[in-house]
């Protein structure tokens, strides 16, 4: 005996109470595949969430965070407050990055400046709360004997005054 339910398209469900008739999904529900015996409730976007994509009879709603907040977790399961560049979110709110660290985004944590000397390079541009240092050629490359058409300006490590 053929299962009549397999004929029910997406956006409907197989209504066993009505001799396996394909009934449309009720409001605020959907079925994304055919042959479903029930429709799923739509995802609800409320509070700190806003609707990115409305629920339809064949596809679920998708949520985003309201302005000033960003998504965390799978499928934007949580919203977290934005901070400014140069800050990180702590339990006490947005706090400026400590000296020697930076954050170039509105989310995430402050990260240490790159240590140019570890790669045998020197600091070309100092770091700030919002930006990492820019590493330049190694000090050896800047020695008088080194060939260079336009030698770069002498660089200094952050926090050090010129020699």
């Amino acid at each position: 005996l053929q299962d009549l339910c397999s004929n029910c398209p997406a956006g409907t469900f197989c209504d066993n109470n009505r001799s396996q008739i394909c009934s449309p999904c009720p409001p605020n529900s959907f079925s994304s595949a055919g042959g479903q015996r029930t429709c799923d409730i739509c995802r609800q976007c409320k509070g700190v969430f806003k609707t990115r994509k409305e629920c339809s009879s064949t596809s679920n709603a998708e949520c985003d965070c309201i302005s000033g907040y960003h998504c965390l977790g799978a499928e934007c399961s949580m919203c977290e407050q934005d901070c400014k560049q140069g800050q990180e979110l702590t339990k006490k709110g947005c706090k400026d990055c400590c000296f020697g660290t930076f954050n170039d985004q509105k989310r995430g944590i402050c990260r240490p400046w790159t240590n140019c000397s570890l790669d045998g390079k020197s600091v070309l541009v100092n770091g700030t709360k919002e930006r990492d240092v820019v590493c330049g050629p190694s000090p050896a490359d800047l020695s008088p004997g080194a060939s260079s058409a336009t030698p770069p300006a002498p660089a200094r490590e952050p926090g050090h005054s010129p020699q």
């Epitope: 029930t38 995802r43 409320k46 700190v48 977790g73 499928e75 399961s77």
Partner: antibody
């Protein structure tokens, strides 16, 4: 830091109403919905409803429809939950919680005892 | 409404044990599943959100997995402070619903 501080314990007679407050601090009160959850002694957590502090919009669990009212005063960053026609089975600890998706911060709870 | 079930309802374990608690939703809730820990006389505390994301400040011995309807909370090595009741909750759609809880006590 984020804090939700609730009002103190209440003892009420059957048929009376109770109004529990939840004062928020350490974040923008109007950005996140406040939810109310209750827990009878030795029982699990029971969701009662939500309130949007920005719009005042609410949504209540079917079980409490017609008996619960959730309101707010944005000028003092405080949410309220009022439950009317109290009966002995409403004896429970009532919690407010901030909704960021999950409930990431909770009040300390308010014990409401309904007894004649 | 979406119903949440949990198993087991209680379990006895020893410090250092690996503990697994399961939670099932009556319909697909994608990843909108959260886990809470509650100790007697205290408010619940968020451990895991989005099925598998560890809440800030929660020890890494706690982990969550699953998607759709079946979810798991795992404590890799049970510590004395982990004896408590654990609840799952769906934040997919209102009415938000909790599982009945799993009490973890000392063997």
């Amino acid at each position: 830091q984020v804090q939700l501080v609730q009002s103190g314990a209440e003892v009420k007679k059957p048929g009376a109403s109770v109004k529990v407050s939840c004062k928020a601090s350490g974040y923008t009160f109007t950005s996140y919905d406040i939810n109310w959850v209750r827990q009878a002694t030795g029982q699990g957590l029971e969701w009662m409803g939500w309130m949007n502090p920005n719009s005042g919009n609410t949504g209540y669990a079917q079980k409490f429809q017609g008996r619960v009212t959730m309101t707010r005063n944005t000028s003092i960053s405080t949410a309220y939950m009022e439950l009317s026609s109290l009966r002995s089975e409403d004896t429970a600890v009532y919690y407010c919680a901030r909704e960021t998706g999950p409930f990431d911060y909770w009040g300390q709870g308010t014990l409401v005892t309904v007894s004649s | 409404d979406i119903q949440m079930t949990q198993s087991p309802s209680s379990l006895s374990a020893s410090v250092g044990d690996r503990v697994t608690i399961t939670c099932r939703a009556s319909q697909r809730i994608n990843n909108y599943l959260n886990w809470y820990q509650q100790k007697p006389g205290k408010a619940p505390k968020l451990l895991i959100y989005g099925a598998s994301s560890l809440q800030s400040g929660v020890p890494s011995r706690f982990s969550g997995s699953g998607s759709g309807t079946d979810f798991t909370l795992t404590i890799s090595s049970l510590q004395p402070e982990d004896f408590a009741t654990y609840y799952c909750q769906q934040s997919y759609s209102t009415p938000f619903t909790f599982g009945p809880g799993t009490k973890v006590d000392i063997k």
